[in-house]
């Protein structure tokens, strides 16, 4: 029967006895750097290359002995898993192996670079199809490793890597924390993070998505014919790498940006049970496990946004945060986030000829997160819309004026320490959907963006009742590209984007003890793309 | 049910060329590795090489390298063993038989297809 | 290449009376990544084909009377027949599967006393 792995990234149209998807990932290179590998086992012969490449540091210990079976083990079971004829993910993916792990599983930060810029060197010497660089490996936060990451990513290469399997904030460790790698973290058959040993699979704001990561069986180095099952991010990484070389094989033009955005957009949402995250990971971290696309065709119509989540900003009084998207996505709307509640807002601001999400703290606060809802828009014209405090008392309002341009998000910011408790509730005049509203002494920021067919609508849940959460969430065939609360008298922690639901959190009602608090207001903007749409067909 | 069935006796001249043929049904054959073993007569088993039928992949006993070829019609669900110069000594039984990543033992077998070569 | 050695050649047993074959690898087919001796046995009655009778050396494959049982690990196995019966009377062959190419003992001809 199916491994259960395997069952779990497919979607259920594709489900039979065996895992036979529509496209092996044959026109992909998969890179692998990780340990040497037993080439000639049955479920990889033919399918992997071993390059010449090895940089790897000597073993510890004076009695070490070096068994080949050993030394093979852990790379074997990921060229495996990526493109195994039997329990790969890819069957018809080629892979090439670079050694930059001993037989003991460590490396050197050098010996990854210089497997990197072979990488880079084989590429520009003979360039092939879509390449996917798999980085089964995590180290301690290395600028330099992730540098060298986002050029190969500029590049062009698709690089996936382990989150790591220490139990901790995957941005700590490195490649994990490079922006322009997938990082991936491990769940295992009930979708629950892995658990290894005392320590299990690394999460957070830097996780992309997780992927079937433990008690994944593969080949082993130990004889031809072996299998062995192996658990940790490595193998959720490996999956990912093979789903990648899958979608890149259906769509070899795919960008980076796009095949995260795929990658996301069709992976199981909200199926892991947060509660195994520390308390304060839980909203950072994404539930999200990866599969394959219901069809490798025809997702281009469709409008592709993610949620990204900036580095807190610390607790001094002007820190700000900082999100940023992808060079080749549109930052559509930005929304704030502190847990204590004292925040003074965000905004979007240009900073090298790129929109980016600043956040900012407050007096006495623990800090802020800025939340960037980053989206693929070809052909986007956006800019921002900024009205000055108003001190009026209809509160501050600002919209897209110019022709042609939609509403895709509204942000506010304030000077004033501590805003909201005590102010009026400002009511927006309805029938203006393209205009954002906010307190009187607060500057609002509307994203206002123009591309073919844009179009987009205002979505809001207001509850009377003080609650700790609100949310409102777009339909079908509409995408969430804007996030916030509308200004009332609850004392709201923030908003952020779940996929396609809008997220407004208030402080917890039995803390602040008071039930006269006035509404929470969740507003979602959801847009969707007729000209993406059209184009779709035309391509059927 | 699950079976292979193996084409019919032949009896070829030295020199001749041949192609014996098992179809396998009743599973799915391009996710299992079918394996050729010859049986001299009175004598034991011999593993000539195996193919798997998904990527058309073989591994040849060493043995029988250059002295057969097998291939694999996934569309047909059918796995042959080839000769181009057939010898007396290729007189035997031969058996194809099918096995899995998670079961690499030959758990089904064909009913054997009888190859004599005699001038 | 692994050289499976069986013995004895032949045997011969009186019916409802024990069988014993033994065999043995030229290099160990247990393996510590996942604990299992790659070792099977198989019958052939005369003009059939082999039939699958144990595997990972001690599993018996469904529809097996439970009178076959294998034994033993990394180099030397044992096939027992607790009880002979008629229908037993057959060829007998060890194979192992873990490394190329795969081998099988000369086999070893069992029949009634």
């Known amino acids: 029967s199916i491994p259960w792995n395997l069952e779990r990234i497919t979607p259920p149209r594709y489900r039979a006895d065996e895992y036979q998807p529509p496209d092996g990932g044959s026109l992909v290179e998969v890179y692998l750097l990780d340990t040497s590998i037993q080439s000639d086992h049955r479920e990889i012969e033919g399918r992997v290359m071993v390059t010449d490449f090895e940089n790897v540091p000597e073993e510890d210990g004076t009695r070490f002995h070096r068994q080949a079976s050993k030394c093979d083990s852990h790379g074997t079971h990921l060229a495996g898993v990526v493109s195994g004829r039997d329990a790969g993910v890819a069957k018809g993916a080629s892979m090439r192996s670079l050694r930059v792990l001993n037989c003991q599983g460590k490396g050197t930060v050098s010996g990854t670079l210089i497997g990197l810029e072979f990488i880079r060197k084989s590429q520009l010497v003979q360039p092939v199809g879509p390449l996917v660089v798999l980085l089964p490996l995590a180290g301690g936060y290395s600028r330099v490793l992730n540098a060298a990451c986002q050029r190969l990513a500029r590049a062009g290469v698709v690089l996936v890597t382990a989150a790591g399997n220490f139990r901790d904030d995957a941005c700590l460790y490195s490649p994990a924390s490079a922006p322009e790698v997938i990082t991936v973290g491990a769940t295992n058959a009930q979708d629950q993070p892995v658990t290894l040993g005392t320590l299990g699979t690394n999460f957070g704001r830097c996780v992309d998505l997780f992927a079937p990561g433990e008690d994944i069986i593969g080949a082993s180095s130990d004889c031809s014919t072996c299998f062995v099952s192996q658990s940790g991010t490595s193998q959720a990484a490996a999956h990912v790498a093979g789903i990648a070389a899958m979608m890149l094989s259906a769509e070899p033009e795919l960008t980076l940006a796009e095949l995260r955005q795929r990658l996301i957009h069709f992976s199981a949402k909200d199926v892991i049970n947060e509660a195994w995250f520390p308390e304060d990971q839980r909203v950072l971290t994404p539930n999200l496990v990866a599969a394959l696309p219901p069809s490798t065709h025809g997702a281009g119509w469709q409008l592709f946004c993610r949620t990204v989540w900036s580095a807190h900003s610390g607790p001094t009084r002007m820190a700000t945060a900082v999100a940023r998207c992808a060079p080749d996505e549109e930052l559509l709307s930005c929304s704030s986030f502190s847990r204590s509640g004292k925040r003074r807002g965000e905004r979007m601001e240009a900073q090298g000829g790129k929109l980016v999400c600043r956040a900012h703290n407050a007096f006495g606060g623990e800090g802020v997160y800025a939340i960037a809802r980053c989206c693929l828009l070809p052909q986007a014209n956006c800019s921002v819309h900024t009205a000055p405090p108003a001190e009026a008392s209809m509160g501050t309002r600002v919209h897209c004026h110019q022709q042609g341009h939609v509403l895709t998000g509204c942000s506010s910011h304030w000077e004033v320490e501590d805003l909201g408790t005590h102010k009026p509730p400002v009511l927006r005049p309805r029938g203006q959907p393209n205009q954002c509203v906010g307190h009187r002494e607060a500057s609002i920021h509307a994203s206002c963006c123009h591309a073919p067919g844009l179009e987009c609508k205002v979505k809001e849940h207001g509850i009377p009742a003080p609650q700790e959460q609100v949310t409102v969430a777009c339909e079908e065939g509409w995408t969430l590209t804007g996030c916030s609360a509308l200004p009332g008298t609850s004392h709201v922690l923030g908003a952020y984007a779940v996929d396609n639901t809008c997220v407004v959190r208030s402080r917890d009602v039995s803390t602040t003890g008071s039930t006269s608090e006035g509404a929470v207001t969740a507003v979602a903007i959801c847009c969707r793309s007729r000209h993406l749409a059209q184009a779709s067909q035309e391509l059927q | 049910q699950v079976q292979l069935v193996q084409s019919g006796a032949e009896v070829k001249k030295p020199g001749e060329s041949l192609k014996i043929s098992c179809k396998g049904s009743?599973?799915?054959?391009?996710?299992?590795?079918i394996s050729w073993v010859r049986q001299m007569p009175g004598k034991g088993l011999e593993w000539m090489g195996l193919?798997?039928?998904?990527?058309?992949?073989?591994r040849y006993n060493p043995s029988f390298q250059g002295q057969v070829t097998i291939s694999a019609d996934k569309s047909i669900s059918t796995a042959y063993l080839q000769w181009s110069s057939l010898k007396a000594s290729d007189t035997a039984m031969y058996y194809c038989?099918?096995?899995?990543?998670?079961?690499?033992?030959?758990?089904?077998w064909g009913q054997g297809t009888l190859v004599t070569v005699s001038s | 290449d692994i050289v499976m050695t069986q013995s004895p050649d032949s045997l011969a047993v009186s019916l409802g009376e024990r069988a014993t074959i033994n065999c043995r690898s030229s290099?160990?087919?247990?393996?510590?990544?996942?604990?299992?001796?790659?070792l099977a046995w198989y019958q052939q009655k005369p003009g059939q084909p082999p039939k699958l009778l144990i595997y990972?050396?001690?599993t018996r494959e469904s529809g097996v009377p439970d009178r076959f049982s294998g034994s033993g690990s990394g180099t030397d196995f044992t096939l027992t027949i607790s009880s002979l019966q008629a229908e037993d009377v057959a060829v007998y062959y060890c194979?192992?599967?873990?490394?190329?190419?795969?081998?099988f003992g000369q086999g070893t001809k069992v029949e009634i006393k």
């Open positions: 194979q192992q599967y873990s490394s190329f190419p795969i081998t």
């Open positions: 193919i798997y039928p998904g990527d058309s992949y073989t």
């Open positions: 009743g599973y799915s054959f391009t996710n299992y590795y």
């Open positions: 038989a099918r096995d899995y990543y998670s079961r690499p033992f030959s758990d089904i």
């Open positions: 990972w050396a001690s």
């Open positions: 290099q160990s087919v247990l393996y510590s990544s996942n604990n299992k001796n790659y």
